[in-house]
């Protein structure tokens, strides 16, 4: 299941591999899928202290 290209990009890269607009990279099976198929972590409550967000899997510009 863990096949495909590895990226050497840093923690703050917007996505580890190019996906077409409206697609996001599924880190667990390592391919591009519709962003709506992936569930993001629960949002932090307002004012909660937490490390700065890292790799955000957003659609590619």
């Amino acid at each position: 299941m863990r096949r495909g290209p590895r990226s050497l990009r840093g923690r703050d890269a917007p996505a580890p591999t190019p996906c077409v607009p409206a697609e996001c990279f599924d880190l667990l099976v390592r391919h591009c899928v519709a962003c709506g198929l992936l569930r993001t972590p629960r949002p932090k409550p307002a004012g909660a202290s937490s490390p700065a967000p890292r790799t955000a899997l957003q659609p590619q510009e």
């Epitope: 840093g10 099976v29 490390p51």
Partner: antibody
Framework: EVQLVESGGGLVQPGGSLRLSCAAS????????WNWVRQAPGKGLEWVGY???????YYNPSLKSRFTISRDTSKNTFYLQMNSLRAEDTAVYYC???????????WGQGTLVTVSS | DIQMTQSPSSLSASVGDRVTITCRAS??????????MHWYQQKPGKAPKLLIY???DLESGVPSRFSGSGSGTDFTLTISSLQPEDFATYYC?????????FGQGTKVEIK
């Protein structure tokens, strides 16, 4: 808020079969990853496998030949079919869903499966 | 499979103590600049509860006395000031490579 409710546990004889159900509410099982995790009495957690948004399944290789995960999207429910059960399969079985990093942030309450003659 | 080894297996501590639990993976669980390492708390008869994901990100609603650190193969869960409700068993988990695997658990008991 995702809620998960397991059912189907109980006593089964060695060599028998059982199907566990996990009914999800608050999100569709056609998105994300939907897991089974088990815990033998007094022991640690063991990942059984998952079914994801596309219906793709992946299993712990030690269990794959006997366990099958499936889903019914119309009921928003996924299942764990367990065959050729052994005493060592006695455990509490949890269903859980994970976010895109694999961390399981919502869990069911667990259902006990006892394999004994 | 990636083997996860937690230490210690159990520990006794008092309310207010600083507690550190370590988890070592048999190979790196980092990929794409992300550590696929998570920490859970479990109390008897209850389902596990996610505390930390991606090595150091605090799950929503989890008290800030919990923190995580590490990368590669070595990770740490720290409770800065142990509270009565923190007596439980803690598990690490990796989701870098299938099959996903858990550590054997660390039981935190009252001294």
């Amino acid at each position: 808020e995702v809620q998960l409710v397991e059912s189907g546990g109980g006593l089964v004889q060695p060599g028998g079969s059982l199907r566990l159900s996990c009914a999800a509410s608050g999100d569709s099982i056609t998105r994300g990853y939907w897991n089974w995790v088990r815990q033998a009495p007094g022991k640690g957690l063991e990942w059984v496998g998952y079914i994801n948004y596309s219906g793709t399944t992946y299993y712990n290789p030690s269990l794959k030949s006997r366990f099958t995960i499936s889903r019914d999207t119309s009921k928003n429910t996924f299942y764990l079919q367990m065959n050729s059960l052994r005493a060592e399969d006695t455990a509490v079985y949890y269903c859980a869903t994970n976010h895109l990093y694999g961390a399981m942030d919502y869990w069911g309450q667990g259902t006990l499966v006892t394999v004994s003659s | 499979d990636i083997q996860m080894t937690q230490s210690p297996s159990s520990l006794s501590a008092s309310v207010g103590d600083r507690v550190t639990i370590t988890c070592r993976a048999s190979e790196s669980v980092d990929d794409y600049g992300i550590s696929f390492m998570h920490w859970y708390q479990q109390k008897p008869g209850k389902a596990p509860k996610l505390l930390i994901y991606r090595a150091s990100d605090l799950e929503s609603g989890v008290p800030s006395r919990f923190s995580g650190s590490g990368s590669g193969t070595d990770f740490t869960l720290t409770i800065s000031s142990l509270q009565p409700e923190d007596f439980a068993t803690y598990y690490c988990q990796q989701t870098s490579k299938d099959p996903w695997t858990f550590g054997q658990g660390t039981k935190v008991e009252i001294k």
